[in-house]
């Protein structure tokens, strides 16, 4: 069977008026994914945005990244898509410095 | 122009289905997700799920995942709403809506879907 | 799920009339608020997204503030257009939820 990733946004300070936004699936199965970032509800092209390998995380599973540089003020225009075995989840920046894990369920 | 334009109501019986259709045009129908929400007479809104037009991935609420099937047809820039055994609590407006971003921007008219015996 | 408090949920006011109508979410939602007006037999209207920004075409009057758990929508002066039902949704996490909506009517 399939298991749904864990999803979960962070922001970080970037250079002065930029903050780099990245998005972690962990914890799914297969390996098959679509991780990215969509700004007003499309996808960015690829050349801007920065993605890490689908590794293995040691428990049979897998986990990616995928990282934008964005100015800031404009988070809330941006979404980490995810899409995995047939079903998708969107998932927001969060405000100020915190984080949040969004789980999605098949 | 945006728009979502949808199928005619509809009039069904316990445990049949219905088929709710979501016509796009004015946009790239691929690029945006399709939310749909379904309101009951007098009642607030209630969140159904969403599809990708250009991938068919869905995500669902828990509420309605084994009843509820979303598609959509890129030939015809049309996305679908099918729900299952009906009951009369499905009695109740259907729209489709566009994400753009982190809203809806755009709705469509609503379908009214009556459930009766 | 988050749940969203609307309030009040009607409320009779006079054309010039200043209106709140507030939405308290059961967990932070990061300003991932919109506000639409729905009138009998149509559709949601989006007037504010993101708490605040206005949408296009919406008449200044309509104003959005709000962060964490609560929000607002005020009508700084009501119209005879703005007799509506409205009703705030929270985009933070699925499933999207929707305040119970808010009935303003004419006193």
């Known amino acids: 069977g399939s298991v749904p990733p864990m999803v979960n946004v962070t922001r970080s300070e970037a250079s002065e008026g930029n903050i780099t936004v990245t998005c972690r699936a962990s914890s799914f199965y297969p390996r098959n994914i679509t991780l990215t970032w969509r700004q007003d509800g499309v996808s960015l092209s690829h050349d801007t945005q920065q993605w890490g390998d689908v590794l293995p995380d040691g428990n049979g599973t897998y986990q990616t990244w995928v990282a934008t540089r964005i100015c800031q003020g404009e988070e809330q225009r941006f979404t980490c898509y995810m899409e995995h075995s047939g079903n998708h989840s969107t998932h927001p920046v969060p405000s100020g410095n915190s984080h949040h894990h969004h789980h999605h369920h098949h | 122009e945006v728009q979502l334009v949808q199928s005619g109501a509809e009039v069904k019986k316990p445990g049949a289905s219905v088929k709710v259709s979501c016509k796009a045009s004015?946009?790239?129908?691929?690029?945006?997700?399709i939310e749909w929400v379904r309101q009951a007479p007098g009642q607030g809104l209630e969140w159904i799920g969403a599809i990708n037009p250009g991938s068919g991935a869905t995500n669902y609420n828990e509420k309605f995942k084994d009843r509820a099937t979303l598609t959509a047809d890129k030939s015809t820039n049309t996305a679908y709403l099918e729900l299952s055994s009906l009951r009369s609590e499905d009695t109740a407006v259907y729209f489709c809506a566009r994400f753009l971003g982190n809203y809806f921007d755009n709705w469509g008219q609503g379908t009214l879907v009556t459930v009766s015996s | 799920d988050i749940q969203m408090t609307q309030s009040p949920s009607s409320l009779s006011a006079s054309v010039g009339d200043r209106v709140t109508i507030t939405c308290r979410a059961s967990g932070n939602i990061h300003s991932y608020l919109a506000w639409y007006q729905q009138k009998p037999g149509k559709s949601p209207k989006l007037l504010v997204y993101y708490a605040e920004t206005l949408a296009d075409g919406v008449p200044s009057r309509f104003s959005g503030s709000g962060s964490g758990t609560d929000y607002t929508l005020t009508i700084s002066s009501l119209q005879p257009e703005d007799f509506a039902t409205y009703f705030c949704q929270q985009f933070w996490t699925t499933p999207y939820t929707f305040g119970q909506g808010t009935k303003v009517e004419i006193k």
């Open positions: 004015g946009y790239a129908f691929t690029n945006y997700l």
